[in-house]
């Protein structure tokens, strides 16, 4: 091991204060006691250290806690957190939501980094599930957080946590993720009345099956086109013209503008043209009158 340079006379740090910003890296290494640093971590954030000086301070903490920092230190890391690697964070045991919030606050506005992803992963795994308070915190800092999880990870979200989800939190979710979230939302909101239920469930409908869409069509919900366009194509195809008309209410006129896009395009191809004509929207591409429609998928299932 390289012999350590001695601290120059009169430079030994008695406390963590602003005089340390004028220390060279080797002086910080030689003159700052790691135990003192650990007990005064809350002061570091107030002092304008350079990134290189922070590296020295981090090195001192690493030497003091080779198995990982205690939560009392982690909670006060402040912007020193930005210096941590995923490998460092995997050694931590973060159990307090306050600690998580403090570290996410430091990272606020930054891109979601591997460090933050690791921190969140460690925290959630430690809790065993993504509870409402945690989800509330994470989506407040990262609106896209929920949609960054795999369907398998989403399966650990309890229905009670769904109350913390805002529509914008689901903006980037794909159908596979909504398939997992929708049944949980249905369960979470099941005791709400019709119109209130629809307001809450609307963002999750990209995971709804046909039978639930049929049920909604009987409730005068007036689904907007943006929501309709996010529905699963396979769930929309079996809906009749009358059901779609009831589902959309006054928004049905918007189908014309979307007739070339999925799922509207595929749905039109499955409808009888004379049924489409009843909408009076000029939708074209339905099955001509007099044609017999064979559902080949049903035929295969029977044979």
């Amino acid at each position: 091991e390289v012999e350590k340079t001695a601290c120059p006379s009169g430079k030994k740090a008695r406390e963590i204060d602003e005089s340390l910003i004028f220390y060279k890296k080797w002086e910080l290494e030689a003159c700052v006691d790691a135990a003192l640093l650990a007990t005064q971590m809350d002061r570091v954030n107030a002092i304008p250290f350079t990134y290189e000086q922070l590296d020295v301070l981090k090195h001192k903490l690493d030497e003091l806690y080779p198995q990982g920092y205690p939560e009392s230190v982690i909670q006060h890391l402040g912007y020193l957190f930005l210096k941590m690697s995923p490998e460092d964070i995997r050694k931590w045991n973060v159990t307090s939501l306050e600690t998580l919030k403090a570290l996410l606050e430091v990272n606020k506005g930054h891109e979601m980094s591997p460090q933050v992803a690791t921190l969140i992963d460690r925290f959630v795994k430690g809790r065993g599930q993504l509870d409402k308070d945690t989800l509330d915190t994470l989506t407040a800092f990262y609106p896209g957080y929920l949609c960054s999880l795999s369907p398998e990870e989403l399966s650990s979200v309890p229905p009670s946590s769904i109350w913390a989800v805002r529509p914008q939190d689901l903006d980037t979710c794909d159908p596979r993720q909504l398939d997992v979230l929708y049944p949980k939302a249905r369960l979470a909101f099941q005791n709400m009345n019709g119109s209130e239920y629809f307001v809450k469930i609307q963002s999750f409908l990209g995971g709804a099956p046909t039978e639930d869409l049929k049920a909604l069509s009987q409730q005068n919900v007036s689904m907007d086109l943006a929501t309709f366009m996010k529905l699963r194509t396979d769930a929309v195809l079996p809906l009749t013209v009358a059901e779609v008309q009831k589902l959309l209410g006054p928004h049905v006129e918007g189908l014309k503008a979307e007739e070339r896009h999925r799922p509207v395009r595929d749905w039109i191809l499955r409808q009888r043209q004379d049924d489409l004509d009843t909408l009076g929207l000029g939708l074209q591409g339905g099955i001509p009158n007099g044609y017999l429609v064979l559902d080949l998928s049903m035929q295969e299932a029977l044979s």
Partner: antibody, heavy 117, light 107 residues
């Protein structure tokens, strides 16, 4: 001695794109955080974005978030700023600088970006 | 965002004069403050960091002081090469923000 040299500026139409580069020399580039700052004609300096030494930590000012992308190539001692969906108000001299956390200790000479139809 | 307000926006002075420029932060920033000098057509140059630390190679006639919200840059004896625009910058939080400058002109 430390040197930072920007390039890639020029005239571009609104909605267009440009990629700025900053070539670094005279120091160990991979050890330092880097930043982009701009100055519109007769206006204040505006900090835009920074990237950590490894490239894993990035931050953007709201004015450019979603349109600009900062990146670096440590093997080539280079910093980049990809600018998309450019607007007239993005017209400025763009500087790269070495970021020390509490201050920017070295700056390039700047490259002029003009967004006009 | 933290707003940085410089005053005055310009000052006329003669060689040998003592010049003081102030910078106020909209909220406390401890000593997370730097000062830069910029000459026309040139990049800014770091003078002071940490509110009072003199950057290597910068003449000792430049000094900085202050903490919290109020900061001062002082040029003890103005030299011909000091006529320029001076900017303060906070680094306490993101986004980093600059003052809009104080122009030091020849009287």
């Amino acid at each position: 001695q430390v040197q930072l040299v920007e390039s890639g500026g020029g005239l571009v139409k609104p909605g267009g794109s440009l990629r700025l580069s900053c070539a670094a020399s005279g120091f160990t580039f991979s050890d330092y955080y880097m930043t982009w700052i701009r100055q519109a004609p007769g206006k204040c300096l505006e900090w835009l974005s920074y990237i950590s030494s490894s490239g894993s930590t990035i931050y953007y000012a709201d004015s450019v978030k979603g349109r600009f992308t900062i990146s670096r190539d440590n093997a080539k001692n280079s910093l980049f700023l990809q600018m998309n969906s450019l607007r007239a108000e993005d017209t400025a001299v763009y500087y790269c600088a070495r970021d020390r956390n509490s201050h920017f200790d070295y700056w390039g000479q700047g490259t002029l970006v003009t967004v006009s139809s | 965002d933290i707003q940085m307000t410089q005053s005055p926006s310009s000052v006329s002075a003669s060689v040998g004069d003592r010049v003081t420029i102030t910078c106020r932060a909209s909220q406390g920033i401890n000593t997370w403050l730097a000062w830069y000098q910029q000459k026309p057509g040139k990049a800014p140059k770091l003078l002071i960091y940490g509110a009072s630390g003199l950057q290597s190679g910068v003449p000792s006639r430049f000094s900085g002081s202050g903490s919290g919200t109020d900061f001062t840059l002082t040029i003890s004896s103005l030299q011909p090469e000091d006529f320029a625009t001076y900017y303060c910058q906070q680094a306490k939080s993101f986004p980093r923000t600059f003052g809009c400058g104080t122009k030091v002109e020849i009287k």
